[in-house]
């Protein structure tokens, strides 16, 4: 999906009214400095891609993450300030709840999310220079 | 094909709490992506609010409050400290690329002593 | 907050003619955030249009909408005796996101 053409301004309202705080609440017990940011963005529409990346695909040793709140939060936001986003997301939900399992939070999980929180800190931040 | 069916009718006195249920059916679906609208009787239409963003109209602050439980992919208005003026038909709707493309079939709620 | 002012308040015509209803608002409204639903007495509403012009799925085409700015329209081309309902605009430019008082078109 190209997030081009979504409504930036509205997903940050949405990210800092209750996205943040639900990552905030599981990332909670882990201290700030226990996870080096390894991901990056350049821009809006690339921090997007990397958002819906790190929340939605499962990967090794973290594949539950797809249906916490902040995961939740972030989808219903995808899908209504970026045109046609959920129609790509369909047949990637019905599948993934055909797998979904007991909910464990692993250290990598909490990494990733750590990431995640990264990606949208800069997403809300377009102007600064990449680092 | 979404499906948003409501809860049932409810008579509440004045002064009591509603909580209006919202199970949505089929397709991709976030139940954070659910706005609540309501509509007096032989009246227009009045948004009230929805969690993506976390907003309220105003004159709802402080008695509405609307959640959602993804688990079973229901979403719940519930509003406090009921008035007679209350008296509406209360209908979940969908949001999708800024508008309300599904709407469940609505919930009558009665305030009346 | 941004306010819609339908008009007229009522319009009537008979089937085969062309409607067409005005909604204004007090702020500019990005033509992505303009909706238009039509409710029929106890029913739902249903969508009709989204971002101004786009014709939600399974409208029939003689539903068209335009406008920009503060003022926007949607057009019946020709009435048919389904079309006799209450319309609605609604912004999704600021919260509130309000609706205009709606417009009904009843048959003369």
């Known amino acids: 999906y190209d997030f081009t053409n979504c409504d930036f301004e509205k997903i940050k309202a949405a990210y800092l009214s209750t996205i943040s705080k639900d990552l905030i609440t599981y990332m909670s017990g882990t201290k700030s400095t226990e996870f080096n940011n390894t991901v990056s963005c350049s821009n809006r529409p690339h921090c997007l891609t990397e958002i819906q990346s790190l929340t939605f695909n499962p990967t090794a040793g973290c594949a539950s993450l797809a249906k916490e709140m902040f995961a939740m939060k972030t989808k219903a936001a995808l899908a209504i300030w970026c045109p046609g986003y959920s129609e790509t997301q369909i047949n990637a939900t019905q599948a993934m709840k055909k797998r979904r399992k007991r909910k464990v939070t692993t250290n990598k999980c909490l990494e990733q999310v750590s990431q995640l929180q990264g990606l949208w800190r800069r997403f809300n931040r377009p102007l600064l220079k990449q680092q | 094909q979404v499906q948003l069916v409501q809860s049932g009718a409810e008579v509440k006195k004045p002064g009591s709490s509603v909580k209006v249920s919202c199970k949505a059916s089929?397709?991709?679906?976030?139940?954070?992506?659910i706005s609540w609208v309501r509509q007096a009787p032989g009246q227009g239409l009045e948004w009230m609010g929805g969690?993506?963003?976390?907003n309220y109209a105003q004159k709802f602050q402080g008695r509405v409050t609307i959640t959602a439980d993804e688990s079973t992919s229901t979403a719940y208005m519930e509003l406090s400290s009921l008035r007679s003026e209350d008296t509406a038909v209360y209908y979940c709707a969908r949001q999708l690329a800024a508008a309300l493309v599904y709407w469940g079939q609505g919930t009558l709620v009665t305030v009346s002593s | 907050e941004i306010v819609l002012t339908q008009s007229p308040g009522t319009l009537s015509l008979s089937p085969g003619e062309r409607a067409t209803l005005s909604c204004r608002a007090s702020q500019n409204v990005n033509t992505r955030y303009l909706a238009w639903y039509q409710q029929k007495p106890g029913q739902a509403p249903r969508l009709l249009i989204y971002?101004?012009?786009s014709r939600a799925t399974g409208i029939p085409d003689r539903f068209s909408g335009s406008g920009s700015g503060t003022d926007f329209t949607l057009t019946i081309s020709s009435l048919e005796p389904e079309d006799f309902a209450v319309y609605y605009c609604q912004q999704y430019e600021s919260s509130p996101y309000n609706f205009g008082q709606g417009t009904k078109v009843e048959i003369k």
């Open positions: 971002a101004a012009s």
């Open positions: 089929g397709g991709s679906f976030s139940s954070y992506a």
């Open positions: 969690i993506i963003p976390m």
